[in-house]
């Protein structure tokens, strides 16, 4: 359920507020609907960077749970093949705040277009 993914993103944003994490993350800020699965996979990969950089058990557990939920939601969409989409490394690098903002936006796109 994508709303549960949103819940975990809110938890992560609450948890990182008191931390200073300098990492920049590959961020898709303008997702074409026909590339949303590819973009989501990039977000999930980059999310693990936040988990590692924070060194925080609560963040690690929340990220782990979020990835499981998101992968379950993606698999329920069936095996979608997308072509002509950007590789993760081609995306713009943004700070954590902007990354999470764009992450919420793409999850909302999955909800809105389901």
């Amino acid at each position: 359920n994508w709303v549960n993914v949103i819940s975990d993103l809110k938890k992560i944003e609450d948890l990182i507020q008191s931390m200073h994490i300098d990492a920049t993350l590959y961020t898709e800020s303008d997702v074409h609907p026909s590339c949303k699965v590819t973009a989501m996979k990039c977000f999930l990969l980059e999310l693990q960077v936040i988990s590692l950089e924070s060194g925080d058990a609560s963040i690690h557990d929340t990220v782990e749970n979020l990835i499981i939920l998101a992968n379950n939601s993606l698999s329920s969409n069936g095996n979608v093949t997308e072509s002509g989409c950007k590789e993760c490394e081609e995306l713009e690098e943004k700070n954590i705040k902007e990354f999470l903002q764009s992450f919420v936006h793409i999850v909302q796109m999955f909800i809105n277009t389901s």
């Epitope: 994508w2 709303v3 549960n4 949103i6 819940s7 809110k10 944003e13 609450d14 507020q17 800020s29 303008d30 997702v31 074409h32 609907p33 999470l100 903002q101 764009s102 919420v104 936006h105 909302q108 796109m109 909800i111 809105n112 277009t113």
Partner: antibody, heavy 119, light 108 residues
Framework: QVQLQESGPGLVKPSGTLSLTCAVS?????????WSWVRQPPGKGLEWIGE???????NYNPSLKSRVTISVDKSKNQFSLKLSSVTAADTAVYYC????????????WGQGTLVTVSS | SSELTQDPAASVALGQTVRITCQGD??????ASWYQQKPGQAPILVIY???NRPSGIPDRFSGSSSGNTASLTITGAQAEDEADYYC???????????FGGGTKLTVL
């Protein structure tokens, strides 16, 4: 600075169709944002009507869904609202608004236009 | 009935602090945004996300969230803060946007 401007008839007859357009300037309707219509009956609170993404995806308030159509015209940088089978209860100030990226918000609003349903 | 509940009215003495609340189960998943609306005017976004203020919004406005409740706090209320305040978020399905019923703030 993004600006939104609603236009359309201020008076609609009962059982008729309310039609409004929102012209977007200072920004592109083909941005990553969703675009919404919100209304406010006189002396009452705000009610979300529905939203559209420039690829044509729409979501509507379940209580209005059977009567609402929102469409987008990228060439004119505008989006439109149609509300059918109107009654006096649909009399309200109608606002168009741009949704922010990420967490729910409306970061830009039109000034609003009063639509009265009366014969 | 609205999925977001606000008290209809609140008051604050000039220069004092007031907190306006918004309750709803959906706020466990989503942050709320807050709008100020004065008579005859369109709403203005004052807080969005965790606690973000759009440019031009005074820093006396702040937002917070705990459990199923979101709060808007005005620290050192001014006469010009007298207005209606609405919270906004998504519903439990995530598909629909919803507003609270609004809180009329009077500055005494």
């Amino acid at each position: 600075q993004v600006q939104l401007q609603e236009s359309g008839p201020g008076l609609v007859k009962p059982s008729g169709t309310l039609s409004l357009t929102c012209a977007v300037s200072g920004g592109s309707i083909s941005s990553s944002n969703w675009w919404s219509w919100v209304r406010q009956p006189p002396g009452k609170g705000l009610e979300w009507i529905g939203e559209i993404y420039h690829y044509g995806y729409t979501n509507y308030n379940p209580s209005l869904k059977s009567r609402v159509t929102i469409s987008v015209d990228k060439s004119k940088n505008q989006f439109s609202l149609k509300l059918s089978s109107v009654t006096a209860a649909d009399t309200a100030v109608y606002y168009c608004a741009r949704e922010g990226i990420g967490w729910p918000s409306f970061d830009y609003w039109g000034q609003g236009t009063l639509v009265t349903v009366s014969s | 009935s609205s999925e977001l509940t606000q008290d209809p009215a609140a008051s604050v003495a000039l220069g004092q602090t007031v907190r306006i609340t918004c309750q709803g189960d959906t706020l466990r998943s989503y942050y709320a945004s807050w709008y100020q609306q004065k008579p005859g005017q369109a709403p203005i976004l004052v807080i969005y996300g965790k606690n973000n203020r759009p440019s031009g919004i005074p820093d006396r406005f702040s937002g917070s969230s705990s459990g199923n409740t979101a709060s808007l706090t005005i620290t050192g209320a001014q006469a010009e803060d007298e207005a209606d305040y609405y919270c906004n978020s998504r519903d439990l399905s995530g598909k629909n946007l919803v507003f609270g019923g609004g809180t009329k703030l009077t500055v005494l």
